[in-house]
């Protein structure tokens, strides 16, 4: 269940940084914003839950990475990839992408100028 830690390699690389952070609060935060009325998500009840819980932890995790456009984009792509299969239709995919692109701004980070969120072979 727990994270495989201590993978050696260049600790400054975006891949290593994205691998070290916990992106689940970001995923929950976005799902809460687009599915607030839905009963269950990922076995955690999001009814009447303040999104600020997830947002604070999400921003803390994103803050752990070097604040570069490339690393932020890789993190957003990873979030998109992790949640792709849970997004039920095209409209939900678009909503998720919109919220995802707003995430850096919500955390007071620079948003990546160009970040292709089309992942999973075009499914998302």
């Amino acid at each position: 269940m727990r994270r495989e830690r201590g993978r050696q390699g260049d600790s400054s690389s975006c891949e290593r940084q994205v691998d070290r952070v916990n992106l689940k609060p970001c995923e929950q935060h976005i799902m809460q914003r687009i599915m607030g009325e839905q009963e269950q998500y990922d076995s955690y009840d999001i009814r009447s839950t303040r999104s600020s819980d997830q947002q604070q932890r999400c921003c803390d995790e994103l803050n752990e990475m070097e604040n570069t456009q490339r690393c932020m984009c890789e993190a957003l792509q990873q979030i998109m990839e992790n949640q792709c299969d849970r997004l039920q239709d095209r409209q939900m995919v678009q909503q998720f992408k919109r919220e995802l692109m707003n995430l850096p701004q919500q955390c007071n980070f620079r948003a990546p100028q160009r970040c292709d969120l089309d992942v999973s072979g075009g499914r998302c």
Epitope: R2, R20, K24, R57
Partner: antibody, heavy 123, light 108 residues
């Protein structure tokens, strides 16, 4: 063996200062957020402060804000708590605790704790 | 600040009985950020449950957690002698990461 060992506690007068240390071993220290939690004699647990892996995000309990400073040295596998302007109510056992998270579902938890170091503030 | 209120303050039961411990939050807490710890006299706290309902490593299945929003519960289905201790809930989603005041589970 995964271990946290606190040191630096002792008797200090009100208004005085103390620096607590926590030595980590048996795991990659720089991969974990760290916390200080205290427990006054006969009382419950009180979260004091937390610091993220790279020290970029730090939080404090309102009761210690402006008086205590948390820091870490990843090269030395050490966590610190600088305590200034100490008050009687800061008397407690201070625990250092490692914070991990479940990679598959995301929740955070403090899974490794030191045995604690005792701080007594008294004139 | 989110205030966590645990009840009862003290619970007196016998081995073999069922224990139900409550933790109520002053504001809604995602169950992703609700943790339970056990502490015995003279010892450091021990992680029991995280994400409200996931047992930590080596925690026996007589321990279970449930709840959402503002109401959370820790249940011990059949008390063993080693279960008598103080139990704390904690929320770690929003700083300050507050603890409840604890429930002391004592032998009747």
């Amino acid at each position: 063996e995964v271990q946290l060992v606190e040191s630096g506690g002792g008797l200090v007068q009100p208004g005085g200062s103390l620096r607590l240390s926590c030595a980590a071993s048996g795991f990659i220290f720089s991969d974990y957020n760290m916390n200080w939690v205290r427990q006054a004699p006969g009382k419950g647990l009180e979260w004091v402060s937390s610091i993220t892996r790279s020290s970029r995000t730090i939080y404090y309990a309102d009761s210690v804000k402006g008086r205590f400073t948390i820091s870490r040295d990843n090269a030395k596998n050490s966590l610190y708590l600088q305590m200034n302007s100490l008050r009687d109510e800061d008397t407690a056992v201070y625990y250092c605790a490692r914070e991990d998270f479940d990679v598959s579902t995301g929740p955070y938890y403090m899974d490794v704790w030191g045995k604690g170091t005792t701080v007594t503030v008294s004139s | 600040e989110i205030v966590l209120t645990q009840s009862p303050g003290t619970l007196s039961l016998s081995p073999g009985e069922r224990a139900t411990l409550s933790c109520r939050a002053s504001q809604s807490v995602s169950n992703m950020f609700l943790v339970w710890y056990q502490q015995k006299p003279g010892q450091a706290p021990r992680l029991l449950m995280y994400g409200a309902s996931t047992r930590a490593t080596d925690i026996p299945d007589r321990f279970s957690g449930s709840g959402s929003g503002t109401d959370f519960t820790l249940t011990i289905s059949r008390l063993e002698p080693e279960d008598f201790a103080v139990y704390y809930c904690q929320q770690n989603g929003n700083s300050p990461y507050t603890f409840g005041q604890g429930t002391k589970l004592e032998i009747k």
